[in-house]
């Protein structure tokens, strides 16, 4: 089975190092508890950028020190990653797990290629 997860192919981060994208998952029923994880893939290496669990009653809540923020609406999650620099350019995969009620489902998006360009330093003005 598995679950279909859709996310944009490419996103360009803002000059402030902020990138936003929507992660949408296909679910036949209404999941009471959902976990969303953003993974960064660099070659064969996979690292967790951030993760959050939300319920029908509660809004999506990342840890206070997380680089991510987000909101949820039905089967869509609006994700924002902050503090990005040029070296963070890469493929960001949205992983969705329907934790409750049974059955458990996991779904992986194909990844969003986030391009980050460091801003040019402002020239000194006399």
């Amino acid at each position: 089975k598995g679950m279909h997860v859709a996310q944009p192919a490419v996103v360009l981060a803002s000059s402030r190092g902020v990138a936003s994208f929507v992660c949408e998952y296909g679910s036949s029923g209404n999941a009471a508890e959902v976990r969303v994880t953003v993974l960064r893939q660099a070659g064969s290496q996979m690292t967790e950028v951030c993760a959050a669990t939300y319920t029908v009653e509660d809004e999506l809540a990342f840890l206070d020190d997380s680089t991510c923020t987000g909101t949820s609406s039905g089967n869509k999650v609006n994700l924002t990653i902050q503090g990005l620099r040029a070296m963070d350019t890469g493929l960001y995969i949205c992983k969705v797990e329907l934790m409750y009620p049974p059955p458990y489902y996991v779904g992986m998006g194909n990844g969003t290629q986030i391009y980050v360009i460091d801003p040019e330093p402002c020239p000194d003005s006399d």
Epitope: K1, G2, M3, E33, R35, I93, M108
Partner: antibody, heavy 118, light 108 residues
Framework: QVQLVESGGGVVQPGRSLRLSCAAS????????MHWVRQAPGKGLEWVTF????????YYADSVKGRFTISRDNSKNTLYLQMNSLRAEDTAVYYC???????????WGQGTLVTVSS | EIVLTQSPGTLSLSPGERATLSCRAS???????LAWYQQKPGQAPRLLIY???SRATGIPDRFSGSGSGTDFTLTISRLEPEDFAVYYC?????????FGQGTKVEIK
Amino acid sequence: QVQLVESGGGVVQPGRSLRLSCAASGFTFSSYTMHWVRQAPGKGLEWVTFISYDGNNKYYADSVKGRFTISRDNSKNTLYLQMNSLRAEDTAVYYCARTGWLGPFDYWGQGTLVTVSS
Amino acid sequence: EIVLTQSPGTLSLSPGERATLSCRASQSVGSSYLAWYQQKPGQAPRLLIYGAFSRATGIPDRFSGSGSGTDFTLTISRLEPEDFAVYYCQQYGSSPWTFGQGTKVEIK
């Protein structure tokens, strides 16, 4: 490096209980879901049970539902399997396994043998 | 529950030959959620392939996976002596997690 080490196996009589442990090291334990998988002598792999990151969500195979309980202590980096009302058909090597980022079981312990016999 | 059926049960081949193992699912499995494992006697299973065709870290390129929907294949292009073992397919997209019954690759 990632390591999973099971312990607690042994010989036990039918109807009795046993508790298995799986000590994890080399990774952030709380960031991964975990499983127990068993293998009866000369047989294939059978998934037994799953536990979520925080331990709030648990799933069981029908064959062990109501008898086995999975739990975890993230502060001790340890996974547990409490096995009650053991039967002869529960005789197997029990493996703990980590769920990789993309879903497959990427690391396994060496296994611990549980023999249920009178 | 998704039932996985592997064939053949046993494959008798010589080193250097090509091995083709089949895994058929009772219902569609997204290709992102199909894995292959290798198990040698007295050892724990080892992840070979995930997402139907991606090799796990450290797995030699003679191992390859293919397929989608309900039919999946593990191919070992040229069997090395250390490849003789039992191979299991697994679906991990939904609970309950299920394994095939295994295919034993033995020396002819």
